[in-house]
Amino acid sequence: EQVKHSETYCMFQDKKYRVGERWHPYLEPYGLVYCVNCICSENGNVLCSRVRCPNVHCLSPVHIPHLCCPRCPDSLPPVNNKVTSKSCEYNGTTYQHGELFVAEGLFQNRQPNQCTQCSCSEGNVYCGLKTCPKLTCAFPVSVPDSCCRVCRGDGELSWEHSDGDIFRQPANREARHSYHRSHYDPPPSRQAGGLSRFPGARSHRGALMDSQQASGTIVQIVINNKHKHGQVCVSNGKTYSHGESWHPNLRAFGIVECVLCTCNVTKQECKKIHCPNRYPCKYPQKIDGKCCKVCPGKKAKELPGQSFDNKGYFCGEETMPVYESVFMEDGETTRKIALETERPPQVEVHVWTIRKGILQHFHIEKISKRMFEELPHFKLVTRTTLSQWKIFTEGEAQISQMCSSRVCRTELEDLVKVLYLERSEKGHC
């Protein structure tokens, strides 16, 4: 039955809710979160709030999976027949309801100290970026309930307590088939201090916000009385309103002036600035702080397609942009890592095809900058130096041999970390 335009309803995670209707949301990577109640308000906005649990007056309160708050044993509801929860199929492997597992290549903007934690909940796979604690030992160990490695004897960090996590659902969003990823998503900002332990409060790109980008419904999350509205974009900790433009801030290199981002409702769309092929003067000059060359003596006007440049130097060495693209389908992952160089003017693309952890194929392509600019599925991940790229390619040669005969889960992801130039290293050239 079609809903008449005059009727008010709420859209939330592709479902329609009537005014006054209440529900528990699906939040990645938890599944159904019983400790959050959502309600469809009269103006069509979704209002979600954390359930406040009353104090229980008994010695051993009992936790029931589908109820948020612990209860005293005498006030428990009657036990129904056991409900069998649906398992999940992901990348050729079956996972049981509640099972945690690690996925590769899902997040384009994964930082070196993050890993991808997934869980199976009621037949749906939920994945999130988990920010791992700094390791203080030489030989960290893997633990069953976390994708982060920990030092032996450390108290294991639970999923809920990890700061700054971003969540994405691979089953229905860009991680699976990222055909039109033309925008550049800056790496997540590391926020110190906590609003709340509930990850939805962390970021506009948290589970609630993410699912609302297409429908236009404003999702208001109320946790600890902190309000967040969805009709803005957040980049690097800064909030931009619809129509506003900015240059993204990329880790250690500050502002990337040759990329221009615009806020479109809640989605940031970033485009590379194209400089003109021909100039009105014979010898246009490269000026620090400008993206495009300018004719001497002429005031460089801020034209569309012309802006400032921040090539970024690291320890006196010029840096170059590194892009990445990951496709996963039918148990096969195609990962492409690309380096854009000025001399020669080209993009070197390293293509990895991995099936069930075994490297099927590796090759290098060199394509023109102009052609590369038209490829929508690459995302700018960092800038690196030629010396770091050399280390990367040497390591790549080793693991391309090693991983063609044995299962490699994280070797390539770990190797990519070499390309990131940490701010902390700046004093140690």
């Epitope: 088939h177 990222s178 055909y179 092929n277 693209s325 496709f327 389908e329 096969e332 195609t334 020669p344 003017p345 080209q346 293509v351 095809t353 099927q360 194929h361 090759h363 290098i364 392509e365 060199k366 394509i367 023109s368 900058k369 102009r370 052609m371 038209e374 490829l375 929508p376 599925h377």
Partner: antibody, heavy 119, light 107 residues
Framework: QVQLQQSGAELAKPGASVRLSCKAS????????MHWIKQRPGRGLEWIGY????????KYNLNFKDKATLTADKSSSTAYILLTSLTYEDSAVYYC????????????WGQGTSVTVSS | DIKMTQSPSSMYASLGERVTITCKAS??????LSWFQQKPGKSPKTLIY???RLVDGVPSRFSGSGSGQDYSLTISSLEYEDMGIYYC?????????FGAGTKLELK
């Protein structure tokens, strides 16, 4: 060794559609772009477009945007081109070719499929 | 679109002769240029890529040169099996564009 085996010759009526195939073997199909090129009798080569089998992303020459549709089936390592609303101008040999700039722009070519449009 | 102007459109040459075919792009193509050879009833075969790099298995009598907008293919000493049509291709920008071809025949 690398081989691109194209389907047999097609005879079609104006207004009809044809689907040509290009089966790849001897290399990692999903790792390389697959291009399609048209060559009319006694004429030069015209680039139609390419498909990246890993992402199924396609790029077309605007002259063929409404004429050709490129698809790829990774399970059978086969690329396809669907030509619709055929006219006499579409009579040509259609080639598929793999693409890797490191080794060469178009390294391996299929043997070509001849399409004849005739009433 | 980038226009590739190839010349000559046809030429006659003798065995052992040095042959040069040129291709001019309508704009700088940053050496993203390939040369192909095609024989009657056959599919094209790649000879040169990135303007001057010889494809494995291609005889060393073939060489490519040029930069910016102007490129050339040279056969240092023509042999009988070199007869055919030669095409240049730019792959600096979409759509990829070919030259109209140079038909090389025996004098």
């Amino acid at each position: 060794q690398v081989q691109l085996q194209q389907s047999g010759a097609e005879l079609a009526k104006p207004g009809a559609s044809v689907r040509l195939s290009c089966k790849a073997s001897g290399y990692s199909f999903s790792s390389y772009w697959m291009h399609w090129i048209k060559q009319r009798p006694g004429r030069g080569l015209e680039w139609i477009g390419y498909i990246d089998p890993s992402s199924r992303y396609t790029k077309y020459n605007l002259n063929f945007k409404d004429k050709a549709t490129l698809t790829a089936d990774k399970s059978s390592s086969t690329a396809y081109i669907l030509l619709t609303s055929l006219t006499y101008e579409d009579s040509a040999v259609y080639y598929c070719a793999t693409y890797s700039n490191y080794v060469g722009a178009m390294d391996y070519w299929g043997q070509g499929t001849s399409v004849t449009v005739s009433s | 679109d980038i226009k590739m102007t190839q010349s000559p459109s046809s030429m006659y040459a003798s065995l052992g002769e040095r042959v040069t075919i040129t291709c001019k792009a309508s704009q700088d193509i940053n050496s993203f240029l390939s040369w192909f050879q095609q024989k009657p009833g056959k599919s094209p075969k790649t000879l040169i890529y990135r303007a001057n790099r010889l494809v494995d298995g291609v005889p060393s009598r073939f060489s490519g040169s040029g930069s910016g907008q102007d490129y050339s293919l040279t056969i240092s000493s023509l042999e009988y099996e070199d007869m055919g049509i030669y095409y240049c291709l730019q792959y600096d920008e979409f759509p990829l564009t070919f030259g109209a071809g140079t038909k090389l025949e025996l004098k």
